[in-house]
């Protein structure tokens, strides 16, 4: 029997203080440029070393990003979001969505990492 | 190791138009952020234009923005930089710079630390 994939997704807010050279990090996605099919979504591509984000170890590449100070990242253009990260101050709250993913057992089994149980 | 060499600089009137080239050799170019960087006297070098081909993006600087387009010719290795309706506030000596492109945009306003390339520069002059 195969084993079965499937993904805990957790949310949280991440304060970052800009450092010197930015946020540190680069994003794909919007709805002219989307990164994962049927979802306009803002993810995370890369993280800078030594960067801000980098430095707080809590931003992952592959998070999604849902808001920027609030504000929602849904069914906005690529250079849209490129733009609202780069006028949002020096401190810098984003809303994420990390999507893990937990290796479970033959399907019909319950393991450990199953998060339905 | 990839080298960089700009030509196309000159002396020209306010209101006229220049085209910058950059020449790279010794990398793999499509794989490279090409970028335009300027530096006026007692000025700090500055950002003027990039262009990210694996990202299909391109960014100016706002001081630039619908006078100056960035262009590159992947079969050739080169960057260029079209410069219309020249001021003199452009006057300055203009580098390319280069960098690995990687996924997606930077949310960060462009920082020559990242840039790994730099050419030695052209000068430009707008009386």
């Known amino acids: 029997m195969n084993g079965r994939v499937d993904y805990l997704v957790t949310e949280e807010e991440i304060n970052l203080t800009r450092g010197p050279s930015g946020l540190g990090f680069n994003i794909v996605g919007g709805t002219d440029q989307q990164y994962v099919s049927n979802d306009s979504g803002i993810y995370v591509s890369r993280i800078k070393e030594n960067g801000a984000a980098a430095l707080d170890g809590r931003l992952q590449e592959g998070d999604k990003i849902l808001s920027v100070n609030g504000q929602d990242l849904k069914n906005l253009l690529h250079q849209d979001a490129v733009d609202l990260f780069r006028n949002a101050g020096y401190a810098v709250s984003l809303r994420v969505q990390h999507r893990l993913q937990v290796q479970n057992g033959p399907i019909g089994h319950r393991g450990e990492g199953d998060p339905s149980g | 190791e990839v080298q960089l060499v700009e030509s196309g600089g000159g002396l020209v009137q306010a209101g006229a138009s220049l085209r910058l080239s950059c020449a790279a050799s010794g990398g793999t170019f499509s794989s490279y952020a090409m970028a335009w960087f300027r530096q006026a006297p007692g000025k700090e070098r500055e950002f003027v234009a990039e262009?990210?081909?694996?990202?299909?993006?391109?960014w100016y600087s706002d001081s630039v923005k619908g006078r100056f387009t960035i262009s590159r010719d992947n079969a050739k290795n080169t960057v260029y930089l079209q410069m219309n309706n020249l001021k003199p506030e452009d006057t300055a000596v203009y580098y390319c710079?280069?960098?690995?492109?990687?996924?997606?945009?930077?949310?960060?306003?462009?920082?020559?630390?990242?840039?790994?390339?730099w050419g030695q520069g052209t000068q430009v002059t707008v009386s």
């Open positions: 710079a280069a960098h690995r492109d990687y996924s997606g945009s930077t949310v960060d306003p462009p920082n020559q630390s990242e840039y790994d390339y």
């Open positions: 262009d990210s081909w694996s990202n299909h993006r391109v």
